[in-house]
Interface confidence: low
């Protein structure tokens, strides 16, 4: 019968030929009376057989990722009679893996949005690399993820590629971060190959800033002839947040005379000081009122950022008008 062991050939061998093993009949006494033949896909081009000894050689570089096994057929002929010594037999040559493929991130570019001030441990995104090497061959395709850029704000779980927040971030200081993740095969051991990907992480705004008046004192004037409803000036606060988190409402905190009102222009986020009652220079030629400003929308969990509304003082001078 036929005698052989399992045949393996390493991929990417740089030698011109590589001895794989021997295929022989147990009737062969070694006197060169038998002739071995190789048939099938790859015979003669990728593999050859020494027709006298049955030794098989790979004569070209193989790529396991292109083809991982070859099915060939062997024949052994008695040279004297021309008859088959053994029935034709099928055998397999397996291409064994080497770590010749780096991990690749197939879904890049990665982008994620996470709210600013998110607590440590918040999941941001999962990145996944794939490795074309054989997952069943040692650690050639066993990956470990690590962070090359992004400390101290982010961390990556070594085995899953899950990126989490490791330090709170303030959008008002920096609104986006580039994180670079490396995937290393061979679970990081010597000979490992690596691939990297960039993740753009954008911080979305939360209402963690209260509006603050630009000025601590405003000076306005109003003519004593001005009718009620007259706009006598504007005041303005600024809010480092954006969008609806920067929408604000102005109001009177203190006006003993109850002469003025403040309405909010929600397009410009300005406070408009309005005359509520007519003024009389001869009766009172100046007024002092206090205004305050608060955000329009403040979720309960963010109220801690909004204690003590910002206030400003408004001095209003009444202008005299000649009366008949």
């Amino acid at each position: 019968g036929w005698v052989w062991n399992q045949f393996f050939v390493p991929e990417e061998m740089n030698t011109t030929s590589h001895h794989i093993g021997q295929l022989r009949s147990d009737l062969d006494n070694g006197n060169n009376s038998f002739q071995y033949k190789l048939l099938g896909a790859g015979a003669g081009s990728t593999f050859i057989i020494d027709e006298r000894t049955g030794d098989i050689y790979a004569i070209q570089k193989l790529d396991r990722e292109e083809r991982s096994l070859y099915i060939l057929r062997a024949q052994v002929i008695d040279i004297a009679t021309g008859r088959a010594v053994e029935p034709e037999s099928e055998f397999v040559i397996k291409v064994s893996d080497i770590n010749d493929n780096e991990p690749k991130f197939l879904d890049e570019p990665y982008e994620a949005i996470v709210p600013e001030m998110s607590p440590e441990g918040t999941l941001v995104i999962q990145v996944t690399a794939s490795d074309a090497d054989d997952p069943s061959s040692g650690n050639n395709a066993r990956l470990l993820y690590s962070l090359l850029q992004g400390q101290p704000y982010f961390s990556v779980e070594p085995t899953t590629g899950v990126i989490r927040i490791s330090s709170k971030m303030d959008r008002e200081l920096q609104d986006e971060y580039w994180v670079i993740i490396q995937a290393k095969d061979m679970i990081g051991q010597p000979g490992a190959l690596s691939g990297t990907t960039s993740v753009l992480i954008k911080l979305s705004d939360v209402n963690d800033n209260k509006p603050i008046f630009k000025e601590s004192l405003y000076r306005l004037t109003v003519s004593e002839s001005a009718p009620t409803g007259t706009s006598i000036g504007t005041i303005m606060a600024y809010d480092n947040d954006i969008g609806e988190n920067a929408e604000m409402d102005y109001s009177i905190e203190e006006d003993d005379s109850q002469t003025f009102d403040i309405i909010t222009n929600h397009e410009t986020q300005e406070g408009i000081v309005i005359l509520k009652k007519k003024v009389d220079f001869e009766h009172q030629n100046h007024y002092g009122i206090r205004a305050k400003v608060k955000n329009h929308h403040v979720p309960e969990q963010l109220m801690k950022y909004h204690t003590e509304a910002s206030t400003t003082f408004i001095k209003i001078q009444v202008e005299d008008v000649d009366e008949p």
Partner: antibody, heavy 121, light 107 residues
Framework: EVQLLESGGGLVQPGGSLRLSCAAS????????MNWVRQAPGKGLEWVST????????YYADSVKGRFTISSDNSKSTLYLQMNSLRAADTAVYHC??????????????WGQGTTVTVSS | EIVMTQSPVTLSLSLGERATLSCRAS??????LAWFQQKPGQAPRLLIY???TRATGIPARVSGSGSGTEFTLTISSLQSEDFAVYYC?????????FGGGTKVEIK
């Protein structure tokens, strides 16, 4: 269409300074690495500096390290090269070049026409 | 640093001929190699990256091959617009380095 337009070149004395700009359009500037590459008269191409998208990582050729500073302004989609302590050997056409995606991140897929820097007394 | 060596320095060929340009790296750079074309007074133009991937708009007559340390740029049938200087460049390691260039001129 991706476009890169360099400016800021000129004649400067040895030891002097210049600031080159590269105005980019047609792509998301902050998502790509950007490069400066120079070419001395009648010579080949020489890489000068690279900045990663977002500006966190910068790299320099040894010949310019400590003298040149690469930077970018994402809000203006503009790349800069601040060149100090200039030498005659810095005389060249300076091109900016956009990086690519993925594995070609630190490559150069689109180039500007260049701006000429002449260092001479 | 990785030294990139291009050969020949000058290649004199006729229209329709095949041009084969070589580029050698002083150590393996995997497939992280690009080829550029430059005409007088113009900016370089990317032809090939990843050693063999054609850039957008590059005709099929231009092809790249090789990996590790030996790379080839082939122009199968030279057209008038192909006469220029060609540079290879590795982007596997810092500093990024270019070859000295090969000038393809009309014979």
């Amino acid at each position: 269409e991706v476009q890169l337009l360099e400016s800021g070149g000129g004649l400067v004395q040895p030891g002097g300074s210049l600031r080159l700009s590269c105005a980019a359009s047609g792509f998301t500037f902050s998502s790509y690495a950007m490069n400066w590459v120079r070419q001395a008269p009648g010579k080949g191409l020489e890489w000068v500096s690279t900045i990663s998208g977002g500006g966190a990582n910068t790299y320099y050729a040894d010949s310019v390290k400590g003298r040149f500073t690469i930077s970018s302004d994402n809000s203006k989609s503009t790349l800069y090269l601040q060149m100090n302590s200039l030498r005659a050997a810095d005389t060249a056409v300076y091109h900016c070049a956009k990086g690519g995606m993925g594995g070609y991140y630190y490559g150069m897929d689109v180039w500007g026409q260049g701006t000429t820097v002449t260092v001479s007394s | 640093e990785i030294v990139m060596t291009q050969s020949p320095v000058t290649l004199s060929l006729s229209l329709g001929e095949r041009a084969t340009l070589s580029c050698r790296a002083s150590q393996s750079i995997s497939s992280n190699l690009a080829w550029f074309q430059q005409k007088p007074g113009q900016a370089p133009r990317l032809l090939i990256y990843g050693a063999f991937t054609r850039a957008t708009g590059i005709p099929a007559r231009v092809s790249g091959s090789g990996s590790g340390t030996e790379f080839t740029l082939t122009i199968s049938s030279l057209q008038s617009e192909d006469f220029a200087v060609y540079y290879c460049q590795q982007y596997n390691y810092w500093p990024l380095t270019f070859g000295g260039g090969t000038k393809v001129e009309i014979k």
